[in-house]
Amino acid sequence: TALSPAPTTMDFTPAPLEDTSSRPQFCKWPCECPPSPPRCPLGVSLITDGCECCKMCAQQLGDNCTEAAICDPHRGLYCDYSGDRPRYAIGVCAQVVGVGCVLDGVRYNNGQSFQPNCKYNCTCIDGAVGCTPLCLRVRPPRLWCPHPRRVSIPGHCCEQWVCEDDAKRPRKTAPRDTGAFDAVGEVEAWHRNCIAYTSPWSPCSTSCGLGVSTRISNVNAQCWPEQESRLCNLRPCDVDIHTLIKAGKKCLAVYQPEASMNFTLAGCISTRSYQPKYCGVCMDNRCCIPYKSKTIDVSFQCPDGLGFSRQVLWINACFCNLSCRNPNDIFADLESYPDFSEIAN
């Protein structure tokens, strides 16, 4: 008999795909709960455990966590399994803000700046590496240079533009070497002339239910790459959208509940109600993903009196054109995931 998660959903913080043969079962079904729910200390959320069985007090910063004993989501905690390789069974609750990064086998701390090579300056933020170029891509003058080419020059870090004339003899593309700064000169130029960069939002971390989407942006006073995150919910897990597809149709691109609703997050309720749109599903092997969306700020009020706000993906329109092995799994063909950064901000 099946003891696996429903195929249309993904864990909020999936453990890495490693050897899990020795992983203990923390969830036991049928559910077994204590006679009465626990009383949680002030400020600790009373939540349903990760097995969807019993009420439990959410694990706090530094506490052990498992598939069953989950970290307090409204405190911005997640379960860091990195210290339990290769089982990834027991983790430690950590701040989402404090996740380190690994790049080319080297581990960097959250907030740490480093230069993996002479061409980039990078910063580790919340598990994501954001890099800014030290080599400015100065475009060659097009009028007098019919065949521009970037070449490596011995002793210089950054490539330089050269112009190949008809005699195939390379020459510099500008009279006064303006296209070739060395690394130090380019750092100064970078700080004088910050190139604003905001990456596209990453796909939602779950194909249904509450997930997280992130992006890197250096649009700030320091011109420093920072990770932004927002909550996302592509479609509810507990609504069978297939039943809403009209006869003769294969897809329902957008699903919108009739009634407005309040968002809930770890027992906290949004201070106003919303009528969100969700992406639908297809009967065939296509996926539906957002293509017109924006980010809104949602304020939450908690039973203990605390309040907080979160950025949330607001879907305006979806399209159903991606091929995928599981119609609800946007990760199946992530390599071909289109970049809608221009229209999905």
């Epitope: 008999t1 003891l3 049928p30 559910c31 204590p34």
Partner: antibody, heavy 121, light 107 residues
Framework: QVQLVESGGALVQPGGSLRLSCAAS????????LSWVRQAPGKGLEWVSS????????HYADSVKGRFTISRDNAKNSLYLQMNSLSAEDTAVYYC??????????????WGQGTMVTVSS | AIQLTQSPSSLSASVGDRVTITCRAS??????LGWYQQKPGKAPKRLIY???SLQSGVPSRFSGSGSGTEFTLTISGLQPEDFATYYC?????????FGQGTRLEIK
């Protein structure tokens, strides 16, 4: 009061499909696991499938695995059972039942009145 | 799958009698067993949960006992409305399984 009402039962040909619904009222639907249980004419009760409160975990009896799909819509307080490749052995009254997980797992504390599914040519 | 064997499969008794129905599990299920009453054309109704706890609203003449593999349902002082079929259910592990039923008839 707490109530479960099944619908969708019908006469269907072998190999055919049918979708049962169960409408719930009188309790917080999204707090409970829900199940389908069936009873062939003149026979005993047989558990069919269970689904967790937010559809993340699902369990099936071996006899229906790969043919039946349980689902729920918490916004509509509804439970569903999609039945495909039906055979005469699936002829039964189908009950939806609420699992009592409020204070440990204690089986089914609330049942619907049942809906009859007949598979015959 | 855990098998539940009920005995007897049918039983004749008179109003006022004390009757006992037994349910035996093929392996230990702790106290994860319930008893259900079903009347013709009706849905089952839970009488006992956790082997010995009485469902609210159920008359106290119904009682349950046992743990592990042996369980009993006792009705002390049968009433006319008690004539029905009784099932035990184990919910210790999936798949949930029911006993084959005990039909209680008027003598």
């Amino acid at each position: 009061q707490v109530q479960l009402v099944e619908s969708g039962g019908a006469l269907v040909q072998p190999g055919g499909s049918l979708r049962l619904s169960c409408a719930a009222s009188g309790f917080t639907f999204s707090d409970h696991w829900l199940s389908w249980v069936r009873q062939a004419p003149g026979k005993g009760l047989e558990w069919v499938s269970s689904i967790s409160s937010s559809s993340r975990y699902i369990h099936y009896a071996d006899s229906v695995k790969g043919r039946f799909t349980i689902s729920r819509d918490n916004a509509k307080n509804s439970l569903y059972l999609q039945m495909n490749s039906l055979s005469a052995e699936d002829t039964a009254v189908y009950y939806c039942a609420r699992e009592d997980t409020s204070m440990a797992t204690n089986g089914f504390d609330v049942w619907g009145q049942g809906t009859m599914v007949t598979v015959s040519s | 799958a855990i098998q539940l064997t009920q005995s007897p499969s049918s039983l004749s008794a008179s109003v006022g009698d004390r009757v006992t129905i037994t349910c035996r599990a093929s392996q230990g299920i702790r106290n994860h067993l319930g008893w259900y009453q079903q009347k013709p054309g009706k849905a089952p109704k839970r009488l006992i949960y956790a082997a010995s706890s009485l469902q609210s609203g159920v008359p106290s003449r119904f009682s349950g006992s046992g743990s592990g593999t042996e369980f009993t349902l006792t009705i002390s002082g049968l009433q006319p409305e008690d004539f029905a079929t009784y099932y035990c259910l184990q919910h210790n592990s999936y798949p949930f399984t029911f006993g084959q039923g005990t039909r209680l008839e008027i003598k």
